[in-house]
Interface confidence: medium
């Protein structure tokens, strides 16, 4: 097993006991990534978010839409399938949305779950270790020591299957330790999150980046993408990339996990797949992940301006939308220019890769994740794909 | 070294067939989708049809589909191109590159030339 | 299924910077960061020089660089050498059932 993986492994582990965040990942299956069987006629299967049907009480398993929700504990939160009640949330339009869940407490949410997390079994390869330091740049004190744990409100009604999630946080330490999983991924300014270059000083700008020959190290897929697929010799590529190998076709089943259909005429708007043709709403593909960014979540200042992505201390349930005593905002809300504003609305590409924002009660910014042929985002932020083609 | 070297190419009747191979050297080849990228004389690239690293998966760019079929005999590190129903706008040299969006590794190409 | 547009065709003399355009749409280019360039010599394979929009493969240099800026990525050649002459292919993973998408070519010549 080559040095990086096996890194990621141990690593992997001390997140584990470090309550960083893992994920816990329901009905893992081809189908549920929204891909395309083979041979389908050339479609762009899109839908308009704020089109979208919210789905709300009496979800069945075969249609509920998976949602995560990043909370503070130690095992999972299952909800109970059929008959949920909706969470009010707040699309990035300012539309409120439903979101077909129930966030329980942490400390509710024990008993059966609470079996650690699996560490994700790397492929062997033939082929010479990869480098384990990421090639981001040492982030300053301001990124959290610890992150909540992460994990999936399964609404199928199935055990989750706990996987490590790509998105992370980053300790404390010297550049050359930094460990493989990085929560600033998508705001890398070369890269996925070139949209969040808005961030002034963020993490991920290439001030810092080792120098190979004048130039980034060229394995920056690292981290995205949990195919662990081995690479050979060649050295600018990472194990684990988006373009080693292609999804491995299952065999159809009847379509599941569903969400309405809408036509799309702003492409770049949420990116979701929509029915086939021909097929009425209700019978689409599964289309997406809910990630939010948890109240405890410490995004930092942002230098030199006057916005403050860190939520303040004390109770995540107040109403401080508006704020209180001129300092604080409710959660998902930040101070910019004396006014609470919505993460959502001051930074429109808060969610990377075609994610919608929605901001929920007691939670905070909350990314709707989705999916295309070929590729699946996922991540607190969408900041992560998953794909074997 | 990695290396793609494909044959089979050569001069072919409109309505005719052809099987192209490419013999891949020096990585797992199992490991990694597959594609044929092909240039027809003084234009640009155009990708055909990529498989998974099993083989269980195959795609085909409309221009192909129903006429040529992808596969890969990963005992023996090959890939290869069914063409059938071979028409005047299939000449070109076809390559096949290692993965399938990004092609970190070409071979060197093989012509088809289909003509009556 | 439409190329991603490149002129057909740019010149530079030695020692200049030139720019060659690869246009696409939000399904493409503008979609998502996975443009790639390509450098290809009369009647060889092509070369993998751009991959993400930015990032070079070890051993290519950093004369080499990319950008993107909506529906448009760009690569930039700085400090011509007669060696740069060659066909530039860009290319852009696609949104659509279609998972990649070339330009049609551009011929460099360095005068």
């Known amino acids: 097993v080559p040095a990086r993986e096996t890194g990621s492994a141990i690593e992997a582990e001390e997140l584990v006991r470090s309550s960083l965040a893992w994920e816990s990942r329901a009905n893992d299956t081809r189908e549920e990534a929204g891909l395309p069987a083979a041979g389908e006629d050339e479609t762009s299967w899109t839908e308009r978010g704020s089109e979208m049907a919210a789905v709300g009480p009496g979800v069945g398993p075969e249609e509920a839409l998976e949602a995560s929700a990043a909370v503070t504990g130690t095992a999972w939160l299952e909800a109970d399938g059929p008959g949920l009640g909706g969470v009010t949330a707040e699309a990035g339009s300012g539309d409120a949305q439903t979101l077909p869940a129930t966030l329980q407490a942490p400390d509710e949410a024990l008993g059966s779950s609470t079996m650690p997390p699996a560490i994700p079994e790397a492929t062997e390869t033939s082929g010479p270790p990869s480098p384990a330091v990421h090639d981001k740049p040492s982030v300053g004190p301001e990124l959290p020591k610890e992150i909540p744990l992460e994990v999936r409100l399964n609404l199928g009604g199935s055990t989750p299957e706990p996987t490590f999630p790509l998105q992370g946080t980053l300790e404390t330490q010297p550049a050359s330790d930094i460990i493989d999983i990085d929560y600033f991924e998508g705001l890398d300014s070369e890269g996925r999150g070139a949209d969040m270059g808005s961030f002034p000083g963020s993490p991920g700008t290439s001030e810092n980046h080792p120098d190979t020959e004048g130039e980034t190290p060229s394995w920056s897929l690292l981290d995205l993408y949990d195919d662990f697929t081995p690479f050979d010799e060649s050295d600018f590529y990472p194990t684990t990339s988006f373009y080693d190998d292609l999804e491995e076709e299952e065999e159809e089943e009847e379509d599941k996990d569903t969400v309405g259909g809408g036509d799309l005429e702003d492409e770049n708007d949420l990116l979701l797949p929509s029915q086939k043709p021909g097929v009425g709403p209700g019978t689409g593909q599964p289309t997406n992940r809910w990630h939010a960014v948890p109240p405890q979540h410490t995004l930092g200042m942002v230098p030199g301006s006057s916005i403050s992505l860190r939520p303040r201390p004390g109770d995540p349930g107040k109403d401080l939308a508006s704020g209180e005593n001129g300092t604080e905002c409710r959660v998902g809300f930040v101070r910019h220019n004396g006014s609470c504003r919505s993460v959502c609305d001051l930074f429109p590409s808060y969610c990377h890769n075609g994610g919608q924002c929605y901001l929920v009660e007691n939670i905070g910014a909350f990314c709707r994740c989705n999916t295309q042929d070929y590729i699946w985002h996922k991540g607190m932020r969408c900041e992560s794909i998953i794909t074997d083609f | 070294e990695v290396q793609l070297l494909e044959s089979g190419g050569g001069l072919v009747q409109p309505g005719g067939s052809l099987r192209l191979s490419c013999a891949a050297s020096g990585f797992t080849f199992s490991s990694y989708a597959m594609s044929w990228v092909r240039q027809a004389p003084g234009k640009g690239l155009e990708w055909v049809s990529a498989?998974?690293?099993?083989?269980?998966?195959?795609y085909y760019a409309d221009s192909v589909k129903g006429r040529f079929t992808i596969s890969r005999d990963n005992s023996k590190n090959t890939l290869y191109l069914q063409m059938n129903s071979l028409r005047a706008e299939d000449t070109a040299v076809y390559y096949c590159a290692k993965k399938w969006n990004l092609f970190d590794y070409w071979g060197q190409g093989t012509l088809v030339t289909v003509s009556s | 299924q439409s190329a991603l547009t490149q002129p057909a065709s740019v010149s530079g003399s030695p020692g200049q910077s030139i720019t060659i355009s690869c246009t696409g749409t939000?399904?493409?280019?503008?979609?998502?960061?996975?443009v790639s360039w390509y450098q290809q010599y009369a009647g060889k394979a092509p070369k993998l020089i751009i991959f993400d929009v930015s990032k070079r493969p070890s051993g290519v240099s950093n004369r080499f660089s990319g950008s993107k800026s909506g529906d448009t990525a760009s690569l930039t050649i700085s400090g011509l050498q007669a060696e740069d002459e060659a066909d530039y292919h860009c290319?852009?993973?696609?949104?659509?059932?279609?998972?990649?998408?070339f330009g049609g070519g551009t011929k460099l010549t360095v005068l």
């Open positions: 498989i998974s690293g099993s083989g269980g998966s195959t």
């Open positions: 290319s852009s993973y696609r949104r659509l059932r279609l998972p990649v998408l």
């Open positions: 939000s399904t493409d280019v503008n979609g998502y960061n996975y």
